[in-house]
Structure formats: structure tokens, C-alpha cells
């Protein structure tokens, strides 16, 4: 990797300057795509900030950018005007350039912020040169709010600053009035005044009457050392504008402004809703607007004018629909800082806000809402509802357009059909079952964010409060006891004060659930079971006949039972018992109670009995006794005592 470019950036005070390829240019010997040349900001600027033209200029500091973004002019340095005047200031950015597998390269970008530079954004080289408004035939003080050369003084080291001043030499006097210093008029023989006199409020302009034409004066300002000596240092020649206004003039009154809402990359006319004034003594064409500061999300243009941005326009342009805002690719809201004047009153600041609407939004549903069975309710989170456009939309609002069938949504404990993303994020939006007849539900919402909407369906499932056995494989052809070591809804029983019951929805593919007789004296054999209770499990009355996969040689396989679990006062839940099976191995200790073992095993042990079809468990096993773990051995003996 190599870095070229000057690595210096000159910025006008208070302005935004893009980084360019002249400033910062990286290349690699491999001819890497500029998109893959990544800069990391190790240490950001101190006197301003670095941001991306098409991302939030008010958000967090920029951390990464690419050479391609530099080429596109999208990486901007904005100098933030300090409260204290300065003549020249220096800032640095420490960057690290990387593009694997090449080694990282460190770079420092020097930023010079100077009033010396020629700045199109600010024609004056002084801290302030704002001009003056004076009523016809009257006088007005020229204060440091209007004219201030403190930045020239700031070029002197602070210990010597008190001994210095700024001398203003008037090179062209006002034509319609007089300048006075301490009530003494300035003239060709005495054409000077000092910054210190300005600061003391001693400079006055007195208008001579006889019309409201513009006035002003030209001057040269430079540093003056101790005892009035001229010293080397910054200097400037400029004009100070004086506007004379009619004493009967009523200033224009700005009206409340509605933000312009526009989708990114599009064009929209500015109307009186965005910019209008009430001025009884001016025509719309006389009310002029000047753009003082433009946002980074687009520009103003005039129909019939050039394609580029305009900085001056009139109320007539607005009223006729000639003024338009052209949005660029940025998704960030912005504000135009404008000044408005009727040419006869001091300019008034105005602003025009531009909201960039997403062209589309998407409701992201990362997971269904899982409701714990014993609670019957659950808070929604960003996992269920989150709106994104070209960014996350934290101010999204939601409205139910189709409610849940088996429950309702509550905000703060009361049923609600509308809620916000903030309420979701704070855990205030809850779904609660009110009808306990389904293990699933769903609702449809309409999400609204920045004027755009989208709908989505949130699915709801109930998470069973059931402890399910997870262990080694079960023997094919055997009947094992289904008991609380395998399925246990005891906690649900305790929480609801009821006896949970199960309904078999599906499975097993190979085998069946049966009710086993307590003793040989009970009539009949095993009965097929489709429903049972927690009590049945605890009583050991249930068996699972583990079948063999049909039509192939015995081999390990997977199987499952899908159950619906019900209890009083809570929604039902679907759960599954997944288990692995393998051909029976008499030498293996199985961690479940076996009520019978496969027929073939008994034959091999020298006790021939009538065989049963493959996959159908035979009668209760008698002898030899297979190894059964965890008390299953005693259970096995008990079950077979009378065989």
C-alpha cells in the first residue's frame, strides 16, 4: 500500500470541505479496487468533525471510510466555529489505511483553518463584517456585532496582545452620511479608527437623510503595534455595507414553516407552506431570500435557471412554484439557514427544514413471539417488530389492522390497538392469551415511519412448560415405560393447580403409545393411547412401544412424538419428544425402564416363543432379564413376576 496526495486540507472557517484525491490518495501495487482501500479514523479532528455526506451528519463520529468515498467527495470535514476569535488554526486526523493482505499504513492528515484563504462561503477575512441597517435620517452605532477584527489580533501571541490594536483606515467614505468616532467626524485628514474604539462603542454612522439609497465605506485593516507602530501581520481590504431603511417601513413577518418531506433522490417544489412572509408594503418579488447555510441532503434550484444550486431567490419564485428542492442520495434530514429581507429592513434569519423520507420501509421480524405456557403472555421486543428503511427507524408507530384471535395486545396493562417502537423497546407492549384453546396465534400490523407504511404479520407460539427426556438411544422392538423421567409437566401442574393432560398429535412413525395393564389380572393387553395425563405418567401406566423401521435391516434411526399439552387457565402448547432408536442390545444398559424386550432376543436366550410381526413388540419379557438402569430393573421384575 502507498499513500500519495498532499495530506493537507485547507478549510475556510466554519465551512465544510470535502477530502479529495489531491489531499488523500491511496493505491496498492495489486491495483486494488478503491472500495477495498479502507481508512480507519484512529484519532478524529479536534476543531471540527468528519462525516459522510450521505449519512447522518449529526450522529456519531465517522470511524471508517474508503478511498472510493474520498473520490466521490463524500467524506467531509466540517470546521466548527469556536467562540473565541482566531486567525489560523491547525487540526490533525490520524488515519490507518488497510487493505489485506498488505500491511497497514499510518497517515496523518493536516488541516489548516485560516481566514487568510479566499473563501467563497465568507467574502470577509474578518471575524465579523455584517453591515449595518439605519433608519433614514437617523444614526446608529457600529458595534462589534457588525464589525469585528478580533481575529487579526488573535494572530499575535496572547502575552503581547494587550499592546496591539487593529487600525482601520477608511479608503472610501460614506456618500450619504458620516462616520464619527467619539462624536468627531472622520475625514480625509483623519481617516482612522481603532478596534479598541469599536469595542468601546465609539464608532457611529449618521445618515444625512434625503432618500433610502445604499451607503457604505471601504477600509483597510491591519495590525498596529505598541506606540502606534505598524507591524507585519495579517491585513485585509474590504467594504462595510450600510442599508438605509424607510422610517415608515414595516418589516416582513416570517410565517410558521412546515418541513418539506421528500423521498431521497427526488425533486419537490417549495411552497408557501415552507416559506412565506407577511409584508404589507412589499411585493413578493421584493422579498429576497439568501441561503446562508445549506444542508448536505440536496440543494435548491430554480425552474428555468441553471441545473446547479441557487443561493438567492424571491418570494415570487416560491409563490409561482419555480423554486424546488433537489434531494441527493442522502437519507439524512437537513436544514437550510436562510436570511430574508425586503431590501428595506434588516435581514431576518429563517430556516427551511427538509425531511428525507425513505422510499420504502421494511418491518423486520426476526423471530415469532414465544409465550411461556404458564404465564400466557409475553412482551414484544425488537425481535418481533423493528422497522428499517435505509436506516433503523426508532420512531416507528404501529397500528393493528388484524388483531390476534386468541388474545389481545396491551400497553401498560390496557388493551391497545396502536403503539410505538419506543413502547416496544421499553417492554410495555404485551401479548396476552385470553382464549386458551390454541397454541398459536398471529396478528397483522401496519407500521408507519417517516410518512411511509408497510404491513407485517407477527406469529405467536406457546412454549410448553414441559421437561423432556434427552438421553441415549432406545431399543427397537422394546416397550419402555413413559414416566416423568421422559415427560414431566409437574411444574405446570404446580403453577396452574391442575392436572396437565396431553394429546398425541403425531408419531411415533415406528411404534405407538399404549396403556399397560397394572397386573396380569387386568383384562386385555396394551391399549392404544391418544390422550393421557400427568397423573398417568406418574402412575407408570403408559408405555412406548418402540417399533423397527419397516422393510430394511435393523439400524439406528430417529423418531419423535408430537404432543399438545393442556392445563387449566393457560394456553395449550405443542411440544415434541425426539428420540433415537437402535437395534436392541442385551448387553447395553438402557437408561429407561423397559417393560418388554424384543421377541428375537428371548429366542436367542433359548426360550422359543411364538414370533410376532417385525416392529410389533412381543408379550412381556420373562427371562433372561436384560440390564435395566435406574430402578428400571425392579420395575422390570415387578412387571414380569407372574409371567
Amino acid at each position: 500500500l502507498s499513500l500519495e496526495g498532499s495530506r493537507t486540507l485547507t478549510v475556510c472557517p466554519g465551512s465544510v470541505q470535502p477530502l479529495s484525491s489531491q489531499t488523500l490518495r491511496a493505491s496498492s501495487s495489486a491495483g486494488t479496487d478503491p472500495q477495498l482501500l479502507l481508512y480507519r479514523v484512529v484519532r478524529g479532528p479536534q476543531l471540527g468533525r468528519l462525516f459522510h455526506a450521505q449519512q447522518d451528519s449529526t450522529g456519531e463520529a465517522l470511524v471508517n471510510f474508503t478511498q472510493a468515498e474520498v473520490y466521490a467527495g463524500n467524506i467531509l470535514y466540517e470546521h466548527e466555529m469556536p467562540t473565541e476569535p482566531f486567525w489560523e488554526a491547525h487540526d490533525t486526523l490520524e488515519l490507518q489505511l488497510s487493505s489485506p493482505p498488505a500491511r497497514d499504513v499510518a497517515a496523518t492528515l493536516a488541516v489548516a483553518v485560516s481566514f487568510e484563504a479566499a473563501c467563497p462561503q465568507r467574502p470577509s477575512h474578518l471575524w465579523k463584517n455584517k453591515g449595518l441597517w439605519v433608519p433614514e435620517g437617523q444614526r446608529a452605532k457600529i458595534t462589534m456585532a457588525a464589525l469585528d477584527a478580533s481575529n487579526l489580533l488573535a494572530s499575535v501571541p496572547s502575552p503581547q496582545r494587550l499592546e496591539h490594536d487593529v487600525l482601520f483606515q477608511v479608503t472610501q467614505f460614506p456618500s450619504r452620511g458620516q462616520l464619527l468616532v467619539s462624536e468627531e467626524p472622520l475625514h480625509a485628514g483623519q481617516p482612522h479608527f481603532l478596534q479598541s474604539q469599536l469595542a468601546a462603542g465609539q464608532l457611529v454612522y449618521a445618515h444625512g437623510g434625503g432618500g433610502t439609497q445604499q451607503d457604505g465605506f471601504h477600509f483597510r485593516a491591519h495590525l498596529q503595534g505598541p506606540a502606534g507602530a505598524t507591524v507585519a501581520g495579517p491585513q485585509t481590504s474590504e467594504a462595510f455595507a450600510i442599508t438605509v431603511r424607510d422610517v415608515n417601513e414595516r418589516p416582513p413577518q416570517p410565517q410558521a414553516s412546515v418541513p418539506l418531506r421528500i423521498t431521497r433522490g427526488s425533486r419537490a417544489p417549495i411552497s408557501r407552506a415552507q416559506l412565506s412572509v407577511v409584508d404589507p408594503d412589499s411585493a413578493p418579488g421584493e422579498i429576497e431570500y439568501e441561503v446562508q447555510r445549506a444542508p448536505h441532503n440536496g440543494f435548491l434550484s430554480l425552474v428555468g435557471g441553471g441545473p446547479g444550486p441557487v443561493t438567492h431567490f424571491t418570494q415570487a419564485d416560491v409563490d409561482s412554484g419555480r423554486l424546488a428542492f433537489v434531494a441527493n442520495g442522502s437519507s439524512v434530514a437537513g436544514v437550510f439557514q436562510l436570511s430574508m429581507s425586503d431590501g428595506a429592513s434588516p435581514p431576518l434569519p429563517m430556516s427551511l427544514a427538509v425531511d428525507i423520507l425513505p422510499s420504502a420501509i421494511e418491518v423486520q421480524l426476526q423471530a415469532p413471539l414465544e409465550v411461556p405456557q404458564a404465564l400466557g403472555r409475553s412482551s414484544l421486543s425488537q425481535q418481533q417488530l423493528r422497522v428499517v428503511s435505509d436506516r433503523e427507524e426508532p420512531e416507528a408507530a404501529y397500528r393493528l389492522i388484524q388483531g390476534p384471535k386468541y388474545g389481545h395486545l396491551l400497553v401498560g396493562g390496557r388493551p391497545a390497538s396502536a403503539f410505538s417502537q419506543l413502547q416496544i423497546d421499553q417492554g410495555e407492549v404485551v401479548f396476552a392469551f385470553t382464549n386458551f384453546s390454541s397454541s398459536h396465534d398471529h396478528f397483522r400490523v401496519l407500521a408507519l415511519a417517516r410518512g411511509v407504511n408497510a404491513s407485517a404479520v407477527v406469529n405467536i407460539t406457546v412454549r410448553a412448560l414441559l421437561h423432556v427426556w434427552a438421553g441415549g438411544p432406545w431399543p427397537q422392538g422394546a416397550t419402555l415405560r413413559l414416566d416423568p423421567t421422559i415427560l414431566d409437566a409437574g411444574e405446570l401442574a404446580n403453577r396452574t393447580g391442575s392436572v396437565p393432560h396431553f394429546r398425541l398429535l403425531e408419531g411415533p412413525r415406528h411404534g405407538r403409545v399404549v396403556r399397560v395393564p397394572r397386573a396380569r389380572t387386568e383384562p386385555g393387553g396394551s391399549q392404544l393411547v391418544e390422550q393421557f395425563t400427568q397423573q398417568d405418567l406418574e402412575d407408570g401406566r403408559l408405555g412406548l412401544e418402540v417399533g423397527r423401521p419397516e422393510g430394511r435391516a435393523p439400524s439406528p434411526t430417529g423418531d419423535s412424538l408430537t404432543l399438545e399439552l393442556w392445563a387449566q387457565g393457560v394456553p395449550p402448547a405443542v411440544a415434541s419428544l425426539d428420540f433415537a432408536t437402535e437395534p436392541y442390545n442385551a448387553a447395553r444398559p438402557y437408561s429407561v425402564a423397559l417393560l418388554s424386550v424384543p421377541e428375537a432376543t428371548r429366542m436367542e436366550a433359548g426360550k422359543p416363543e411364538s414370533s410376532t410381526p417385525t416392529g410389533e413388540p412381543g408379550p412381556m419379557a420373562s427371562s433372561p432379564v436384560p440390564a435395566v438402569a435406574k430402578g428400571g430393573f425392579l420395575g422390570f421384575l415387578e412387571a414380569n413376576m407372574f409371567s
Partner: antibody, heavy 112, light 107 residues
Framework: QVQLQESGPGLVKPSQTLSLTCTVS?????????WNWIRQHPGKGLEWIGY???????NYNPSLKSRVTISRDTSKNQFSLKLSSVTAADTAVYYC?????WGQGTLVTVSS | DIQMTQSPSSLSASVGDRVTITCRAS??????LNWYQQKPGKAPKLLIY???SLHSGVPSRFSGSGSGTDFTLTISSLQPEDFATYHC?????????FGQGTKVEIK
């Protein structure tokens, strides 16, 4: 705040259908969640009859389900109760209510 | 259906008394309980929702508490305008059900 007002005949003959309407002001019936009908037999407790929701779905008290219909007219911002095959046991003050606010109630007497 | 049982069915108290009314559900209602006040010939008015949340405009002398199946409405200092019948109602499971009411009378 939302205001509710019941209207309908105060006297209904046995075996006929009781019909009441609730007019909602200060809010839309497409935004409030539940729009309920509740009744109170003279000197007795309150009995929930059923509701219609913002999206037009219903739920009824199982004890009355076979005889009840609750519908709505969004253009008029109203919802209605129909209770068929009434008997003297249906004599009560009938209220319409959302979650927070109730109408003042209307007494319906079932008598020939 | 969830049965709601209020106790006592009536009570006599004086102005300034602390009054407690209880409501028991036949099984857990997850806190989804409202309390209403009803005066003769008038419609019920919501006082408390979701066990303990005070409805807007309701004086702070009214408070609610409880969980699971047992809930309480407390009037910290009874005022003349509080003599009325009080009803609890669950909205945890359909059908919504009410208690039979507790009448608070002047002693």
C-alpha cells in the same frame, strides 16, 4: 375523552329481538380496542354480553352466544347489539362501554 | 369461566375511615383486573386498571394491589362521595367476568 350513548326501545315483547345502538363520540370505533355490551339485572351484579373489536371481530359470553349479535357501522361510528328470543330474564339496564368509559345505560324491559 | 368473588358484599364505614375490599378469582388472572365505582342509577366508572394503575382523574386515595388470585381495593380515607357500590372485573380470560359488587354504606 370518549363518550358513549345507548339508544333503542325501552320495552320489548317476549320472544322478540332486543336491538340497541351505541353512538361513540370523541374517538373512533376503529381505534379503540374493545367495544363492549354489558348488562345489569335490577339490583344485581354486572354481566358481560360480548364485544366487537376495532377490526370487526367478535366475542360473546357463552351463556348468551346463541342469541347475541354485535355489529358495527364505522361510517356512523356506532356499534349495535341484537339479542333474540328475549324473555323476562333479559330485563336489565344495558350499557355500552370501551375499556375506560361507559354509556349512561338504558333500561330494557321485556314484557307483553 | 373465571369466577370473581368479592368480600364483603356490603360494609358500613364513616368518613375518614380506611376501607378495604377484596376480590378473589377462581384461578390466576395475571393482574388483569379492573375496579369500578357505581352510584345508584348511574353507570360504573373505572377507578383502577391492571390491578394498581389509577385511571386518569381518579383521586389518589384509591389504590389497588394483589397478584395471582387475590386482589384488594383500598380507600385510604373515605370521603362522602365514595359511598357507592364497587365492582371488580377480570380481563385475563374470556368471558370477562365481574364480582357481585360490594356496597359501601354510611355507618
Amino acid at each position: 375523552q370518549v363518550q358513549l350513548q345507548e339508544s333503542g326501545p325501552g320495552l320489548v315483547k317476549p320472544s322478540q329481538t332486543l336491538s340497541l345502538t351505541c353512538t361513540v363520540s370523541g374517538g373512533s370505533i376503529t381505534s379503540g380496542y374493545y367495544w363492549n355490551w354489558i348488562r345489569q339485572h335490577p339490583g344485581k351484579g354486572l354481566e358481560w354480553i360480548g364485544y366487537i373489536t376495532y377490526d370487526g371481530s367478535n366475542n360473546y359470553n357463552p351463556s348468551l352466544k346463541s342469541r347475541v349479535t354485535i355489529s358495527r357501522d364505522t361510517s356512523k361510528n356506532q356499534f349495535s347489539l341484537k339479542l333474540s328470543s328475549v324473555t323476562a330474564a333479559d330485563t336489565a339496564v344495558y350499557y355500552c362501554a370501551d375499556f375506560d368509559y361507559w354509556g349512561q345505560g338504558t333500561l330494557v324491559t321485556v314484557s307483553s | 369461566d373465571i369466577q370473581m368473588t368479592q368480600s364483603p358484599s356490603s360494609l358500613s364505614a364513616s368518613v375518614g375511615d380506611r376501607v378495604t375490599i377484596t376480590c378473589r378469582a377462581s384461578y390466576g388472572i395475571r393482574g388483569y383486573l379492573n375496579w369500578y365505582q357505581q352510584k345508584p342509577g348511574k353507570a360504573p366508572k373505572l377507578l383502577i386498571y391492571y390491578t394498581s394503575s389509577l385511571h386518569s382523574g381518579v383521586p389518589s386515595r384509591f389504590s389497588g394491589s394483589g397478584s395471582g388470585t387475590d386482589f384488594t381495593l383500598t380507600i385510604s380515607s373515605l370521603q362522602p362521595e365514595d359511598f357507592a357500590t364497587y365492582h371488580c372485573q377480570q380481563y385475563s380470560a374470556l368471558p370477562w367476568t365481574f364480582g357481585q359488587g360490594t356496597k359501601v354504606e354510611i355507618k
